[in-house]
Amino acid sequence: ESLGTEQRVVGRAAEVPGPEPGQQEQLVFGSGDAVELSCPPPGGGPMGPTVWVKDGTGLVPSERVLVGPQRLQVLNASHEDSGAYSCRQRLTQRVLCHFSVRVTDAPSSGDDEDGE
């Protein structure tokens, strides 16, 4: 499934929303990396439209900020992309997933890094 700003037509949902998520995932990326966040819906069923929010502000898709079903990609990340990201159910603002993202000045070595 390709990421991008193209629209997707959605059919009927299978389930109502599940419980809110527990803890926040902490991620570290290097400058210039692509920040990739994934948030599968609880219970596995569609939950209506979703929105990605950074530091309380809704993210709008662009050439650099790509959204897909339950996924977010921020290309060519810089320090300004650091912050608290959440994937929320658009309708209720119920938080589905929570991420703390830190973009370091140094480019990534290519290995996956775990935040503390």
């Epitope: 959605v10 949902a13 929303p17 929105v51 809704g58 309708l91 603002q93």
Partner: antibody, heavy 121, light 110 residues
Amino acid sequence: EVQLLESGGGLVQPGGSLRLSCAASGFTFSSYDMSWVRQAPGKGLEWVSGIYSGDGSIYYADSVKGRFTISRDNSKNTLYLQMNSLRAEDTAVYYCAKDAPTNEPSRFDYWGQGTLVTVSS
Amino acid sequence: QSVLTQPPSASGTPGQRVTISCSGSSSNIGNNYVSWYQQLPGTAPKLLIYADSKRPSGVPDRFSGSKSGTSASLAISGLRSEDEADYYCASWDYSLSGYVFGGGTKLTVL
């Protein structure tokens, strides 16, 4: 001041097509979710379709699925509804409705004045 | 028939308090917010209540919303003649993957 101005309504024969437009001003159009809601003469409100900027998703009411297509042109601040294979029961006033900011609970906080679509032979 | 059920009509005298109900299910009201809209004769709908009980700026505090389980209510206190209108509840329905409206309640101020 937020303004939504629908156009494109009129009389069309059953099986025909029509494209409605909604010109938006007074807000950053590309950042907001938008919907079409219709009201048949003397009847209640019926949500038709919504287009969601946060994840690029589009939803339709079962009654129009496969016949209507919602789209937007952010460069023109305009929302569209392409209506094909029109039926008599599609006769209604069609309203364009703006949703709340994407980091707030969804609701239709501004509405256009509506455009009348009449499907009749 | 609408997914959300409202009484077709309600009435009251000036100064009275009236309540309009909206009944749904776990796939809509039970797991989602409810909003209420007022439609004066010959005009477009106007948002009255959102997120079950919040009022947009400019809406008098005579209007209030509440929700319990799969039902919601709109209360109008200190009824005025200008409140005569149609009132609609709305919510997203997860099983239909779309918004649903109640059939509307015509409020008459006697």
